[in-house]
């Protein structure tokens, strides 16, 4: 028995082919006997039942002459998942074909970090087929009547080459997926006390019409509770804002990409927050880590002390030294301090590695008195 | 070509109201944010009042918020500034202002209609 | 709402001079920021959109820049057409603002 897999929707061949690869009589039939089409030796095609019962039934009467007598089925069903039987040179030959459906959970256009189920459904009792999707940017996912793709990434959007493939017979079908999310998935800034903040939010894909919601919540290292900082809508890319505190003074840019300003770095401001976007139509929220480290440089009592507050990492080093001079102290930590610093221009730096992440300067007078 | 014609203005005294009107030829009014900008005799130019495209979102400077209205009416083509309250501070030559379509900058001005509130 | 401290507020300079203007924004607003030129009795037209974009049919000697929150037009070599007040306005959010504005007069 041959097999030939086809797509809901789509089109079928069952082959069906003469030893002599000439014309000749031949039938297809249903496996209850029924007929389908036929020709009986005038060239012409016979269609059995009614022209509307049997009109997306076909044959390539172009191959005829080679001995090649396929039914073709247009806009395959589900219910057409059966064998068919083609008659000719007084031989029967028995095609399965197999009809399958895809379905994608909860669909094609997706948030980031959401999953994507695609199961295939038939009504044959087939055994497991083997199901592989590949990306143009070469990542492949298979499964067999179910395959998932979980923690999507904006990366994952475009077009998808999939098969199935059951008893060595393939079939193929694309799918073009849509992952929103924004561009990156964290960011960090790094400011000096008292300098201004910027702070965007790409997105990764463009819509003509964007329509939704979101809120910045922020979470002060210095802070008990996360505070909300601002709530917003998002009506065909138009941001306007609803309500935003009074500590700090935040503005939002009323076109996108999202973006937020703050007057001024000041620690208790420094720590991280969570932007989300809910858009309409869609379920789930799109999600961005923003950190906000803070550098604080000050004299007092004799006593320089440099210090971040933030989200720093472990491997970060906070170095204190007189300018175009050797690093006074040198530190894993958030604090250094130089008691009774010398006369002069003084510089803290934060570093992770060989890469400064930020620097502050400090003018350091006989009299004790700091000037920044 | 796109052109934008005030109207409305006139001599008002202060606490009346007036209404401004200002219609739109030569452009699809639903797709553009649109302004209105005054300029006191002698000052400098002062940002009232603005509408998104779809009319939905509607924006006020300070010292007009609570006492002026803008609305538009999209199948007339023409942007309302509703103004109430009016105090001798609001004399001035008023602009309507079309947008660029991804508000950019205003491309396109109207010539002006003056108010003038006076007892 | 944001600030735009324009200066200066007027300006004295002869044919053939490079004028600049600035204006600082109290917060950060991208590059959303506009140049425009005002004749007595004239509705202002723009110049510059979005810090640097040259409008068409604005002569090239306009141009705009930015450093993190201060904006400037330079005119590389002012013409008889140019006297007239110069605005600077800030687009980023609602309310818009404008700066004071920048008398260019004849010297």
């Known amino acids: 028995k041959t097999l030939v897999l086809g797509k809901e929707g789509e089109s079928a061949e069952l082959p069906c082919e003469s030893s002599q690869k000439k014309i000749t009589v031949f039938t297809w039939k249903f496996s209850d006997q029924r007929k389908i089409l036929g020709q009986h030796g005038k060239g012409v095609l016979i269609r059995g039942g009614s022209p509307s019962q049997f009109d997306r039934f076909d044959s390539k009467k172009g191959a005829w002459e080679k001995g090649s007598f396929p039914l073709i089925i247009n806009k395959l069903k589900m219910e057409d998942s059966q064998t068919y039987i083609c008659e000719l040179e007084n031989r029967k030959e028995e095609v399965e074909l197999w009809v399958f459906k895809v379905t994608f959970s909860p669909g094609t256009s997706l948030l980031q970090g959401q999953s994507l189920t695609l199961t295939l459904d038939s009504n044959s009792k087939v055994s497991n087929p083997l199901t592989e999707c590949k990306h143009k940017k070469g990542k492949v996912v298979s499964g067999s009547k179910v395959l998932s793709m979980s923690n999507l990434r904006v990366q994952d959007s475009d077009f998808w080459n999939c098969t199935v493939t059951l008893d060595q017979k393939k079939n193929w079908f694309g799918m073009t997926l849509s992952v929103l999310g924004f561009q990156k998935a964290s960011s960090i800034v790094y400011k000096k006390e008292g300098e201004q903040v910027e702070f965007s939010f790409p997105l990764a894909f463009t819509v003509e019409k964007l329509t939704g919601s979101g809120e910045l919540w922020w979470q002060a290292e210095r802070a008990s509770s996360s505070k909300s900082w601002i709530t917003f809508d998002l009506k065909n890319k138009e941001v306007s804002v609803k309500r935003v505190t009074q500590d700090p003074k935040l503005q939002m840019g009323k076109k996108l990409p999202l973006h937020l300003t703050l007057p001024q770095a000041l620690p208790q401001y420094a720590g991280s927050g969570n932007l989300t976007l809910a858009l309409e139509a869609k379920t789930g929220k799109l999600h961005q880590e923003v950190n906000l480290v803070v550098m604080k440089v000050a004299q007092l009592n004799n006593t320089l002390t440099c210090e971040v507050m933030g989200p720093t990492s472990p491997k970060m080093r906070l170095t204190l030294k007189q300018e175009n001079q050797e690093a006074r102290v040198s530190e894993e930590q958030k604090v250094v301090q130089v008691v009774a610093p010398e006369t002069g221009l003084w510089q803290c730096l934060l570093s992770e590695g060989d890469k400064v992440k930020m620097d502050s300067r400090i003018q350091v007078l006989s009299r004790g008195v700091n000037q920044t | 070509e796109v052109e934008l014609l005030e109207s409305g203005g006139g001599l008002v005294q202060p606490g009346g109201s007036l209404r401004l009107s200002c219609a739109a030829s030569?452009?699809?009014?639903?797709?553009?944010?649109m302004s209105w900008v005054r300029q006191a005799p002698g000052k400098g130019l002062e940002w009232v009042s603005g509408?998104?495209?779809?009319?939905?979102?509607?924006y006020y400077a300070d010292s007009v918020k609570g006492r002026f209205t803008i609305t538009s009416d999209n199948s007339k083509n023409t942007l309302y500034l509703q103004m109430n309250s009016l105090r001798a501070e609001d004399t001035a030559v008023y602009y309507c202002?079309?947008?660029?379509?991804?508000?950019?900058?205003?491309?396109?001005w109207g010539k002006g209609t003056t108010v003038t509130v006076s007892s | 709402a944001i600030q735009m401290t324009q200066s200066p507020s007027s300006l004295s300079a002869s044919v053939g001079d490079r004028v600049t203007i600035t204006c600082r924004a109290s917060?950060?607003?991208?590059?959303?920021l506009g140049w425009y030129q005002q004749k007595p009795g004239k509705a202002p037209k723009v110049l510059i959109s979005?810090?640097?974009s040259l409008q068409s049919g604005v002569p090239s000697r306009f141009s705009g820049s930015r450093s993190g929150t201060d904006f400037t037009l330079t005119i590389s070599s002012l013409q008889p057409e140019d006297f007239a007040t110069y605005y600077c306005?800030?687009?980023?959010?609602?309310?818009?603002?404008f700066g004071q504005g920048t008398k260019l007069e004849i010297k």
């Open positions: 030569g452009l699809t009014f639903s797709t553009f944010a």
């Open positions: 202002a079309k947008e660029g379509y991804n508000w950019n900058y205003m491309d396109v």
């Open positions: 306005l800030q687009d980023y959010t609602y309310p818009y603002t």
């Open positions: 917060h950060g607003i991208r590059n959303d």
């Open positions: 979005e810090t640097s």
């Open positions: 509408i998104s495209g779809s009319g939905e979102n509607t």
